[in-house]
Interface confidence: low
């Protein structure tokens, strides 16, 4: 399996909410001995290996934001810690998983990484990640809503997020 990032860039005004999304692609083993660990973190724009460095999102580490479940099951972080920081990560049974950030500030600008680890009990683990940029803007040139830019060839380069 691999991880796809539908959008590589999110440009949002201050104060807006945004949902960053990753999608699990390919065959997913739904056996009872397989679980998926999904999480989010910030990273730096290292030119050799993207997402190699794990920085917290609004002081929450990737451990704080993780989802742990089997196959394409739905899950979400509803614990108070994340919500107190205006964050919520979620996953659906179609392989999509996301992190929602509320009331964006300029400090939220940066590179965000989603991480999926397939854990096969007593055997091995397979990990893949995806990266996307969030740019929070202020002032006269800031968009009125979030604008998202596809990662690869699609009909529209910029789609205004609802």
């Amino acid at each position: 399996f691999k991880v796809a990032t539908p959008y590589s860039l999110y440009v949002c005004p201050e104060g807006q909410n945004v949902t960053l999304t990753c999608r699990l692609l390919g065959p997913v083993d739904k056996g009872h001995d397989v679980t998926f660990y999904k999480t989010w973190y910030r990273s730096s724009r290292g030119e050799v290996q993207t997402c190699s460095e794990r920085r917290p999102i609004r002081n929450l580490t990737f451990q704080d934001l993780h989802l742990h479940h089997g196959g394409h099951q739905a899950a979400n972080t509803s614990h108070d810690l994340a919500q107190r920081h205006g964050l919520e990560s979620a996953s659906d049974h179609h392989g999509n998983f996301s992190i929602t950030m509320r009331n964006l500030t300029l400090l939220d600008s940066g590179l965000y990484c989603c991480l999926v680890v397939e854990i096969r009990h007593h055997h091995s683990e397979h990990r893949v990640h995806g990266a996307m940029e969030l740019q929070v803007q202020t002032g006269k040139d800031a968009p009125s809503n979030c604008v998202v830019y596809p990662s690869s060839s699609q009909d529209s380069e910029n789609i205004t997020a609802a």
Epitope: S8, L9, V11, S44, R45, E47, L106, S109, A131, E133, Q135, Q137, G139, D141, A142, P143, V147, Y149, P150, S151, S152, S153, Q154, E157, N158
Partner: antibody
Framework: QSLEESGGRLVTPGTPLTLTCTVS????????MAWVRQAPGEGLEWIGT??????TYYPTWVKGRFTISKPSSTTVDLRMTSPTTEDTATYFC??????????????WGPGTLVTVSS | DIVMTQTPSSVSAAVGGTVTINCQAS??????LAWYQQKPGQPPKLLIY???DLASGVPSRFSGSGSGKQFTLTISGVQCDDAATYYC??????????????FGGGTEMVVK
């Protein structure tokens, strides 16, 4: 990963010219590519960027004088529609960190020289 | 259009000394700024990105700082090999479709 520009030569003013950047080991569906030029003894001047999805961005001064395209999975073209003597420069192609416009140029080609003269 | 103004246009440095090069954006670009080094007959080489992050393989004597509109490249313990022209680059993405030239005018450094 490498980039190499080609197509630079002596042309007369008004004669269209296409420069080609040939990439090796680079997935053009994942990275933005840019063209940057440098007139003799002058600084760097950004001409434009083509995103991973094929969308193009140009500075305001370009005004249709240049067109960037991706004709294949390994080439990025810069078309000079009607060159003037002021377009005499070394033309570089560069690979961005990521797929969209706002990016750092981590990898550059050696450049190709275009001379526009009558 | 965002305009990038680089100062000084030239600087002379002694081996072992320290040099600072400044770059000013006409409006805030947060930390979306890179620095490049270019030697005659060669393409530019990335030194610093995100205003202060060192690109791989770049010696630690190069450092970057700043945010918003004001940025600085500092070269400590200057070496002969550092003689080159240095450029700043703005890569702030604006949803306003007007883009200026993203590079500063360059600073030529001579090492004595």
């Amino acid at each position: 990963q490498s980039l190499e520009e080609s197509g630079g030569r002596l042309v007369t003013p008004g004669t269209p010219l296409t420069l080609t950047c040939t990439v090796s080991g680079i997935d053009l569906s994942s990275y933005a590519m840019a063209w940057v030029r440098q007139a003799p003894g002058e600084g760097l001047e950004w001409i434009g960027t083509i995103s991973s999805s094929g969308h193009t961005y140009y500075p305001t001064w370009v005004k249709g004088r240049f067109t960037i395209s991706k004709p294949s999975s390994t080439t990025v073209d810069l078309r000079m529609t009607s060159p003037t003597t002021e377009d005499t420069a070394t033309y570089f192609c560069a690979r961005g960190h990521y797929g969209y416009f706002g990016t750092v140029f981590a990898l550059w080609g050696p450049g190709t020289l275009v001379t526009v003269s009558s | 259009d965002i305009v990038m103004t680089q100062t000084p246009s030239s600087v002379s440095a002694a081996v072992g000394g320290t040099v600072t090069i400044n770059c000013q954006a006409s409006e805030s670009i947060q930390t979306y700024l890179a620095w490049y080094q270019q030697k005659p007959g060669q393409p530019p080489k990335l030194l610093i990105y995100d205003a202060s992050d060192l690109a791989s393989g770049v010696p630690s004597r190069f450092s970057g700082s700043g945010s918003g509109k004001q940025f600085t490249l500092t070269i400590s313990g200057v070496q002969c090999d550092d003689a080159a022209t240095y450029y700043c680059q703005n890569y702030y993405f604006s949803t306003n479709s007007n883009y200026g030239d993203v590079f500063g005018g360059g600073t030529e450094m001579v090492v004595k």
